[in-house]
């Protein structure tokens, strides 16, 4: 038996009862997997909100855009998308919200055209260091990935391995230097407390970096110097207190960067003076007139651009004999 062929003008759906029959035989070039909708004209397959527990084996060879969102995949094994013949055209793969908690080494191997990958909204307790590089070689074959979307992939506290979540993600990004061509990286909403200092230096092609809605307190040890192509840096909704001179100078030196800093708890004391001076001068920060102080209490809601040096003082540190308990 064969599933209905996809029409050039609309999506076709396969009947669920055909699933077992189809998966046992080699895929026909134009067939559509059970529980999926296919459009050959749009080169698109959508298997959305179907509670799938594994990636369909009988994906059509023409697929360029594959949506596997809202499923229950749990684990993405090595070669999860390896097929004979390979899915040579697959360029965009969206796996968001599919309850993935483990992505194994080589999960995306044999996808030579894969440019966009979205793993957002999956509780990734176990992301293999070789999930994107495919091998444990010190230098892997370059990945074709240009966009990697990893928003809200942090698992609940009780499901985390006994290791740094930031470190696990960064290890996967840096393994084998496979992602040298990556242009967009989204890591929003991941409870990141810090950014490992080596991560950005090894992603030299980045154009867009989204670190919004994390818990970053400082950028002191992060270097942006090599990111000469960076166009947008999203740091909204973090825990940043101040940006220091080294960071300011590096950002100022990037020729077409736009930095977004809204909704951080800026501490408007004497350490903020350099940042305020820079903000008044720079074109780098978008919406800079919206930035306000959070601390100290007497400065709350004051607009950073309206502050002058007299406003930015630090309370003197009392000698121990004068401090109260």
């Amino acid at each position: 038996s064969s599933s209905p062929t996809s029409s050039a003008s609309s999506f076709s759906s396969s009947a669920p009862f055909l699933a077992s029959a189809v998966s046992a035989q080699p895929p026909l070039p134009d067939q559509c997997p059970a529980l999926c909708e296919c459009s050959e004209a749009a080169r698109t397959v959508k298997c959305v909100n179907r509670n799938l527990t594994e990636v369909p084996t009988d994906l059509p060879a023409y697929v360029r855009n594959l949506f596997l969102t809202g499923n229950q995949l749990a684990v993405l094994p090595a070669g999860a998308f390896a097929r004979r013949p390979p899915l040579a055209e697959l360029a965009a793969l969206n796996l968001s919200g599919s309850r993935l908690d483990e992505v194994r080494a080589g999960a995306f191997e044999h996808l030579p055209s894969l440019r966009q990958l979205d793993l957002s909204h999956n509780p990734l307790a176990d992301l293999s260091p070789f999930a994107f590089s495919g091998s444990n070689a010190s230098v892997s074959a370059p990945s074709p990935l240009v966009e990697l979307i990893l928003n809200h992939i942090v698992p609940p506290e009780d499901e985390r391995q006994n290791r740094s979540f930031e470190g696990m993600v960064v290890a996967a990004l840096l393994a084998g230097r496979a992602l040298q061509g990556l242009r967009r990286l989204e890591l929003a909403s991941n409870h990141f407390l810090y950014l490992p200092r080596d991560v950005l230096a090894q992603l030299p092609s980045l154009r867009h970096l989204d670190l919004s809605n994390n818990s970053l307190v400082s950028l002191t040890y992060v270097s942006f110097r090599n990111l000469t192509h960076l166009e947008s840096l999203h740091l909204e909704d973090n825990a940043l207190k101040v940006l220091h001179n080294g960071t300011l100078a590096e950002l100022q030196g990037l020729p077409h960067i736009r930095v977004f800093l809204d909704n951080n708890p800026w501490v408007c004391d004497c350490h903020m003076a350099d940042m305020v001076t820079w903000l008044k001068e720079t074109e780098v920060v978008q919406g800079k007139d919206r930035l306000t102080c959070a601390y100290p209490e007497k400065m709350r809601n004051r607009v950073l651009l309206e502050l002058n040096s007299a406003d930015l003082d630090c309370d003197p540190i009392l000698p121990p004999s004068l401090q109260t308990s």
Partner: antibody
Framework: EVQLLESGGGLVQPGGSLRLSCAAS????????MSWVRQAPGKGLEWVSY????????SYADSVKGRFTISRDNSKNTLYLQMNSLRAEDTAVYYC??????????WGQGTLVTVSS | DIQMTQSPSSLSASVGDRVTITCRAS??????LNWYQQKPGKAPKLLIY???SLQSGVPSRFSGSGSGTDFTLTISSLQPEDFATYYC??????????FGQGTKLEIK
């Protein structure tokens, strides 16, 4: 009402110097970056120079780099363009404009600079 | 340097016509593009900023679209006061602006 008024244009010989001024009113001058843009007779617009709100950052078009200097006096609400080593191809109407995040949202009426012997 | 190329260089149209002017950048500039109108002997006036945002006070018959390298300015129904020269301008690089060569819109 935002107003920008250029002055200082005129006839100057090749190799000579001229200083243009732009008096600003109707907005908080020290809060805005500013730019100079020029337009040769019968030609299109050419961006010339940029200065940040407190003068810490400046930039220039390649065609004027090393010859023109942009500056500002926030206490006088005035923008300047010092033009040295003038050439015939610098002949143009020079406009000052308020620069807001890459957008030139207000312009003066311009002052004509003629470089000729 | 980023080059901006406008087309056509000149255009004849009648009152009430729908007119489209295009601007092409020599590399991707995201949405960092503005449009200006200039009438003879006058300073340029900002119409559209950030590719598609209408400047306050500008009639709604003006609209802008595009991103990357290709942009358009559209006047939905030409009015007598719209006959002028139109310029696009990019601001992808901080502090380094470039204009298109202009499109002269004339009465047919």
């Amino acid at each position: 009402e935002v107003q920008l008024l250029e002055s200082g244009g005129g006839l100057v010989q090749p190799g000579g110097s001229l200083r243009l001024s732009c008096a600003a009113s109707g907005f908080t001058f020290s809060s805005y970056a500013m730019s100079w843009v020029r337009q040769a007779p019968g030609k299109g617009l050419e961006w010339v120079s940029y200065i940040s709100s407190y003068g810490g950052y400046t930039s220039y078009a390649d065609s004027v780099k090393g010859r023109f200097t942009i500056s500002r006096d926030n206490s006088k609400n005035t923008l300047y363009l010092q033009m040295n080593s003038l050439r015939a191809e610098d002949t143009a109407v020079y406009y000052c404009a308020r620069y807001h995040s890459g957008v030139l949202d207000y312009w003066g009426q311009g002052t004509l600079v003629t470089v000729s012997s | 340097d980023i080059q901006m190329t406008q087309s056509p260089s000149s255009l004849s149209a009648s009152v009430g016509d729908r007119v489209t002017i295009t601007c092409r950048a020599s590399q991707s500039i995201s949405s960092y593009l503005n449009w200006y109108q200039q009438k003879p002997g006058k300073a340029p006036k900002l119409l559209i900023y950030a590719a598609s945002s209408l400047q306050s006070g500008v009639p709604s018959r003006f609209s802008g679209s595009g991103s990357g390298t290709d942009f358009t300015l559209t006047i939905s129904s030409l009015q007598p006061e719209d006959f002028a020269t139109y310029y696009c301008q990019q601001y992808y690089y901080h502090y380094l602006l470039t204009f298109g060569q202009g499109t002269k819109l004339e009465i047919k």
